[in-house]
Interface confidence: low
C-alpha cells in the first residue's frame, strides 16, 4: 500500500524502469544498475535476482524485469520462480536427507526428481500384472485373470500402498 500524497501524486508519472526519488524532489530517476521496477509509480527499484552458485541465468535482468534463474546440470528447480535447486537423482531413486537412495521394492520413480511411488495395484481394478514393475518403471496391468488362458497368468504380489508424499529416510 502506498499513500497518494495529493490528487496528482508526482510519483504516479514515473514509468517502469524508474523510481520516484524522494532525495531528488520526487523526480523519476532511472533504476540504477542491477535493479528494476516492473510497474510505474514505484518509490524504489527492486534489486535484481542474482543467479549464483547452483543457479544459472535463464533471462538477464533489465530495468523493467527481474532476472530469471534455472539450475545447473545435475539439479532441478523447485518452488515458484525456481526459488530452490534440488539435486537430481537417477531414475529408480529418490532424494532423502542422506542423498539419493534406491526405491524400495514395490515402488518406482521414472524421473530424476520426486519420490518413489508404489506400483499400481492391478488387482484393485480387477486386472492382472502383465509386465512386472522395476525401480524405474510401474507395473503394466493387463486383462483380468479370468480373461487369460490357463498358465498365462503372471502373479506379482501387490506392494503395500504408501502414504502419498512419504519419502523413506
Amino acid at each position: 500500500f502506498e499513500r497518494t500524497r495529493s490528487l496528482q501524486d508526482p510519483c504516479s508519472n514515473c514509468p517502469a524502469g524508474t523510481f520516484c526519488d524522494n532525495n531528488r524532489n520526487q523526480i523519476c530517476s532511472p533504476c540504477p544498475p542491477n535493479s528494476f521496477s516492473s510497474a510505474g509509480g514505484q518509490r524504489t527499484c527492486d534489486i535484481c535476482r542474482q543467479c549464483k552458485g547452483v543457479f544459472r541465468t535463464r533471462k538477464e535482468c533489465s530495468s523493467t524485469s527481474n532476472a530469471e534463474c534455472d539450475c545447473t546440470p545435475g539439479f532441478h528447480c523447485l518452488g515458484a520462480g525456481c526459488s530452490m535447486c534440488e539435486q537430481d537423482c537417477k531414475q529408480g531413486q529418490e532424494l532423502t536427507k542422506k542423498g539419493c537412495k534406491d526405491c524400495c521394492f514395490g515402488t518406482f520413480n521414472d524421473q530424476k526428481r520426486g519420490i518413489c511411488r508404489p506400483w499400481t495395484n492391478c488387482s484393485l481394478d480387477g486386472k492382472s500384472v502383465l509386465v512386472n514393475g522395476t525401480k524405474e518403471r510401474d507395473v503394466v496391468c493387463g486383462p483380468s485373470p479370468a480373461d487369460l488362458s490357463p498358465g498365462a497368468s503372471s502373479v506379482t504380489p501387490p506392494a503395500p500402498a504408501r502414504e502419498p508424499g512419504h519419502s523413506p529416510q
Epitope: 524522494n22 540504477p32 518509490r43 524504489t44
Partner: antibody, heavy 121, light 107 residues
Framework: QVQLVQSGAEVKKPGSSVKLSCKAS????????INWVRQAPGQGLEWMGN????????NYNQKFKDRVTLTVDKSTSTAYMELSSLRSEDTAVYYC??????????????WGQGTLVTVSS | DIQMTQSPSSLSASLGERVTITCKAS??????LSWFQQKPGKAPKTLIY???RLVDGVPSRFSGSGSGQDFTLTISSLQPEDIATYYC?????????FGGGTKVEIK
C-alpha cells in the same frame, strides 16, 4: 569490509568554521548517499543533510541550510561537511553514515566513529 | 518538519521481560520509519526499517509494527546487551526527523 573513518576531534571558537572529513572504503563510494547526523551531549540525533557522490546532488535540513556545505572528493572516496558561524550549541558529535540509492528503503547501515566538535571561547 | 514523539523517555525492566517503546508521528508517514539502538559512546545501529523489516543480523527478539502515525518497537525478552537508548526516525519526508529517544535500563 565497509568502513567510514572520520577525522579527529576539533576545538573551535564561536564564529569560526570547521570542516570534517569522512573517508569511505570497502564499497563503491559513488553508489551510496552520505548523510551527516549530529548529536549534542546527552541529547538526541539530528539529520543535517546528505550528498550523492556520483553527481554531488545535495539535500540540506533547512535548519542548517545557510551554514552547512557538503562536498565529496571521489578520487579519495572522502566526504566533507563544513559548518560555519559556529556557536556553542553546535558542540556535538558529528557522524557520517551511508544510505543506499533508494530513499524509501533507507537504512543507515554503516556509520563513522563520530567526530567531537567543541565550540568554546 | 514532521515531529516524532517517542515514549517513554526512559524505562526500567527486568531481564527476560517484554519491552515496548512507541513513536507517534505528527502526520501520516506511511511505513517509512526506522528504529535505532545506541550504546554509550557508540554510533547508532539500525535495527528495523520500513516499520517492521528487521535488518540482517539483528536478533529476532526485536520487532516493529505500525503504520500511518503510530509505531511500536518491541523487545520480546530483554537481554543484558539490549541496555541502550532507542530512537525512531521518520523518512517519509525530508528532512528525516528522529524521536527524542528511550533509555532502557535493567531493573
Amino acid at each position: 569490509q565497509v568502513q567510514l573513518v572520520q577525522s579527529g576531534a576539533e576545538v573551535k571558537k564561536p564564529g569560526s568554521s570547521v570542516k570534517l572529513s569522512c573517508k569511505a572504503s570497502g564499497y563503491t563510494f559513488s553508489s551510496y548517499w552520505i548523510n551527516w547526523v549530529r548529536q549534542a551531549p546527552g541529547q538526541g540525533l539530528e539529520w543535517m543533510g546528505n550528498i550523492y557522490p556520483s553527481d554531488s546532488y545535495t539535500n540540506y535540513n533547512q535548519k542548517f541550510k545557510d551554514r552547512v556545505t557538503l562536498t565529496v572528493d571521489k578520487s579519495t572516496s572522502t566526504a566533507y561537511m563544513e559548518l560555519s558561524s559556529l556557536r556553542s550549541e553546535d558542540t556535538a558529535v558529528y557522524y557520517c553514515t551511508r544510505t543506499w540509492e533508494f530513499y524509501y528503503d533507507s537504512v543507515f547501515d554503516y556509520w563513522g566513529q563520530g567526530t567531537l566538535v567543541t565550540v568554546s571561547s | 518538519d514532521i515531529q516524532m514523539t517517542q515514549s517513554p523517555s526512559s524505562l526500567s525492566a527486568s531481564l527476560g521481560e517484554r519491552v515496548t517503546i512507541t513513536c507517534k508521528a505528527s502526520q501520516d508517514i506511511n511505513s517509512y520509519l526506522s528504529w535505532f539502538q545506541q550504546k554509550p559512546g557508540k554510533a547508532p545501529k539500525t535495527l528495523i526499517y520500513r516499520a517492521n523489516r528487521l535488518v540482517d543480523g539483528v536478533p529476532s527478539r526485536f520487532s516493529g509494527s505500525g503504520s500511518g502515525q503510530d509505531f511500536t518497537l518491541t523487545i520480546s525478552s530483554l537481554q543484558p546487551e539490549d541496555i541502550a537508548t532507542y530512537y525512531c526516525l521518520q523518512y517519509d519526508e525530508l528532512p528525516p526527523t528522529f524521536g527524542g529517544g528511550t533509555k532502557v535500563e535493567i531493573k
